[in-house]
């Protein structure tokens, strides 16, 4: 058995006689023999769920469900519970009605076994009837919704007379039907003016019904119609069994470069018609199980399931329905020796399901893991600028395929053939397992005898040891020019575009530092700053090499204080900025600003 | 050692231009971050910022001034020259260049941490 | 232009006062403002850049601080070369602009 509606709502006034009905609640069953006892909880409730007193004033027909006075509330009662509810003005009380069998502690009330019912309080008495609007006449202020089960025995879930509008206005006339297209399961009975359902619903042709109650007003000569919305909601249970959308039971998937731990493999999607069960309980009833093959695959894959609820179309509606997506998963970082093809099986089982037929379904992934060897090209040509500044990235090394690597550990070595003359170094890149070359010893570039650098890079797995080899030949360029005493550490601090390019700074390949024009439209990730190369900072990535030091790239490295109109970056530096940012990397601070208008080239131009 | 000696005319009558020169030692005038500025005080009165000339070349002015005045350098010599229009009486004042550069240890922030002693500027017909 | 406000416009104070001068502007200059001093007759003199970076050979009584709007000059004793007229200048918009001045007076 179960309540319709989880909440009734109903007008109590002062002094209302004894005997006056109030409504009616309904309960539907589950089963064909089951038959529906109501009773009330003992208590009334106020504001904040405040036990205020005994409830010695309503009472209900078990059998029918009709709520009812049994003895007047006068004023002097009304104060009694006033006073118990905290302080505040008493406009609502609320009782509890059970369902029995159900047995339900008194201080829980969770549908589908108790239902609320709310009775708005006015400190007056009933209203005579030629006042009351056709509204009021024909409907609770609070607008009804409906809960109804799929696959039950059909019966009454509503009842549209207002009653205590009916006791005590016995000379309206009030009539009611419902507007609702062909060959929708629900009636109204004209006498009895009871809503039931024909037959059993199937949440999986229709979850909503948007149906309208037409309320017809006879008063006299008067006639008037009120319309409001009347919505029942279809539940679900767990009557469709697992199916695989277009048939799709096996997916293939090759294991080369993306041999990291969490990497998803492959995905195969198994589509269920229910909504249920509900997203808390659904990986504990919706399981799956890789099935025992070699010990090997059992450790190196799980399956991850991912469920989401999705709409389909259903008789011109659309119902929800869930697709559960099986990922086939790396469980650990996988060595580039490791070769090997496999077949594994995953077991579903939605244990929820009754029948017909069975919850359960077999998934194949067929599974190919690859070796990976390591290359690099026999040589690397660079050329460095004699004035770059230390922390100059100049370029990339990165074995064949590099980019594409996660869960591939390699490291760059170099080695010099010339010991004085050992002026670059080399980082890897956490992002794509490149080698970032970069100037390590400025005071090497200017030696006449370092005109020409020459390096073996190294390329290393970590987990195999196996190596990969090329040479690396540095052309040194151009004459070096000493750095002006004036300037700051880092390009970054320069808020002026000609303040920028006269100084240098950390990680500058050229020894100037480079303007970056923003353009202007608010809060950009292209906002104006000062940078060492607008190849590299900012970015909005704070790499390998920008880390070695601050002064490099504030702007996407800080984790300080930003002024002024941005969006952080994550986890640090600037995403977006206003204007012009420039930074401070010994106080730990950005400014974004607008762009100072009074530019003294403005002024120049302007005279 | 770096000075600034303001040189010109003490005596200018009123719609005559003024001509003032600056002359720097112990630093270049093209140097980073190396700028110099005009600044002038009437007698008992408050300082005020009359116009900067930059390393880069670039110049800016007094608002109220900017019609009347002109700034420029010849690095060469060590020279920055402020010339202004239309002198007026309410011009009379003591006139100062002083180096405005970058301060260590950062070389963040700039100061004006050079004058010259001044040169007293009178203007009367 | 940026307007600054110095106060108060002076004051009288005995060797070893505390004496605080405060500079406001007209609008945010983050910290772009120095102090300056200047005796009668003379150059004036750069004490404090970036709001509260003592310059070189400023002695240690002088402290600046603040950042937007307003800004402080504090002499934590007063010594008897410290009377003078004060001086903040804002070189973060143009025209750059001095205060009015504080003169530093023996009581």
């Known amino acids: 058995l179960y309540f319709s509606r989880d909440a009734y709502w109903e007008k109590l006034y002062v002094d209302q006689a004894a005997g006056t009905p109030l409504l009616y609640v309904h309960a539907l069953r589950d089963a064909p023999e089951e038959v529906p006892s109501f009773r009330l909880g003992q208590h009334l409730y106020g504001t904040y769920r405040t036990r205020l007193h005994e409830n010695n004033w309503i009472c209900i027909q078990e059998d029918t469900g009709l709520l009812y006075l049994n003895r007047s509330l006068d004023h002097s009662s009304w104060e009694k519970l006033s006073v118990r509810n905290r302080g505040f003005p008493l406009l609502t009380v609320y009782l509890k009605v059970f369902l029995s069998p159900t047995s339900l502690r008194e201080g829980e009330c969770q549908w589908p076994g108790c239902a609320r019912v709310y009775f708005s309080f006015f400190n007056t008495s009933f209203p005579a009837c030629s006042s009351l609007k056709p509204r009021e006449l024909c409907f609770p202020e609070t607008r009804p919704s409906f809960r109804i089960r799929e696959n039950r025995p059909p019966g009454t879930f509503h009842q549209f007379r207002l009653l205590p509008v009916q006791f005590l206005c016995p000379n309206i006339s009030v009539a009611y039907r419902l507007l609702e297209g062909e060959g929708l399961p629900f009636r109204c009975a004209p006498d009895s003016l009871e809503v039931s359902t024909r037959w059993a619903l199937d949440r999986e042709q229709r979850e909503k019904y948007e149906l309208v109650a037409v309320c017809t007003v006879h008063a006299g000569a008067r006639e008037e119609v009120v319309m409001v919305p009347f919505p029942v909601t279809v539940y679900d249970e767990d009557d469709s069994a697992p199916t695989f959308p277009a048939g799709v039971d096996t997916a293939s998937a090759v294991v080369e470069f993306k041999r990291k731990e969490d990497t998803v493999v492959a995905t195969l999607r198994v589509f269920d018609a229910d909504v249920v069960p509900a997203s808390g309980e659904l990986v504990r009833r919706y399981t799956s199980t890789l099935l025992p093959g070699d010990t090997w695959a059992q450790q190196t894959f799980r399956v991850e399931h991912w469920p989401n609820e999705t709409s389909v179309q259903a008789n011109g509606s659309f119902v929800r329905a869930t697709v559960h997506d099986y990922r086939l998963v790396l469980n650990r970082n996988l060595s580039i020796s490791e070769n090997r093809t496999m077949q594994l099986a995953v077991l579903v089982n939605d244990s929820d399901f009754q029948g017909p037929g069975a919850g359960v379904l077999l998934l194949h992934f067929n599974v190919s893991v690859l070796p990976v060897s390591l290359h690099l090209p026999s040589t690397y040509s660079l050329s460095v600028s004699r004035r770059a500044r230390r922390f100059a990235q100049i370029g990339k090394v990165c074995v064949e395929n590099c980019q594409a690597f996660s869960g591939i550990n390699v490291q760059y070595k170099l080695h010099s053939s010339g010991a004085n003359c050992s002026t670059l170094g080399v980082v890897t890149s956490a992002e794509d397992t490149s080698g970032i070359l970069f100037v390590n010893d400025t005071k090497a570039l200017r030696r006449p005898k370092c005109a020409e650098l020459h390096y073996m890079v190294v390329a290393t797995d970590q987990q195999t040891s196996r190596q990969a080899q090329a040479q690396l030949l540095v052309t040194v360029e151009g004459s070096y020019v000493a750095e002006e005493a004036g300037c700051p550490l880092s390009c970054a601090v320069s808020k002026r575009r000609l303040e920028c390019e006269e100084c240098g700074g950390l990680g500058s390949p050229t020894g100037r530092c480079e303007w970056r024009q923003g353009d202007g439209k608010g809060i950009t990730r292209n906002f104006s700053t000062c940078s060492p190369s607008t190849k590299t900072c900012p970015d909005g990535h704070c790499d390998v090499v920008e880390t070695q030091d601050i002064n490099i790239c504030p702007q996407d490295c800080l984790r300080g204080s930003i002024v002024g109109g941005h969006e952080p970056g994550e986890p640090r530096g600037i995403k977006a900025g206003y204007g012009t940012c420039n930074c401070f990397p010994e106080e730990e601070k950005c400014f974004c600003e607008p762009e100072d208008i009074q530019d003294p080239l403005c002024d120049e131009l302007c005279r | 050692q770096v000075t600034l000696k303001e040189s010109g005319p003490v005596l200018v009558k009123p719609t005559e231009t003024l001509t003032l020169t600056c002359t720097v030692s112990?630093?270049?005038?093209?140097?980073?971050?190396?700028?110099v500025s005009w600044i002038r005080q009437p007698p008992g009165k408050a300082l005020e910022w009359l116009a900067h000339?930059?390393?880069?070349?670039?110049?800016s002015y007094s608002t109220s001034l900017k019609s009347r005045l002109s700034i420029s350098k010849d690095t060469s010599l060590s020279q920055v020259v402020l010339i202004m229009t239309n002198m007026d009486p309410v011009d009379t004042a003591t006139y100062y260049c002083?180096?405005?550069?970058?301060?260590?240890?950062?070389?963040?922030?700039?100061?004006?941490?050079?004058w010259g002693h001044g040169t007293t500027v009178t203007v009367s017909s | 232009a940026i307007q600054m406000t110095q106060s108060p416009a002076s004051l009288s104070a005995s060797v070893g006062d505390r004496v605080t001068i405060t500079c406001r502007a007209s609008?945010?200059?983050?910290?772009?403002l120095g102090w300056y001093q200047q005796k009668p007759g003379k150059a004036p003199k750069l004490l404090i850049s970036?709001?509260?970076s003592l310059q070189s050979g400023v002695p240690s009584r002088f402290s600046g601080s603040g950042s937007g709007t307003d800004f402080t000059l504090t002499i934590s004793s007063l010594q008897p070369e410290d009377f003078a007229t004060y001086y903040c200048?804002?070189?973060?918009?143009?025209?750059?602009?001095f205060g009015q001045g504080t003169k530093v007076e023996i009581k």
């Open positions: 002083a180096r405005r550069t970058t301060m260590a240890p950062y070389y963040y922030y700039y100061g004006m941490d050079v």
């Open positions: 112990g630093f270049s005038l093209s140097s980073a971050r190396m700028g």
């Open positions: 000339i930059f390393s880069t070349d670039e110049k």
């Open positions: 609008q945010g200059i983050r910290n772009d």
């Open positions: 970036a709001a509260s």
């Open positions: 200048l804002q070189d973060y918009k143009y025209p750059w602009t």
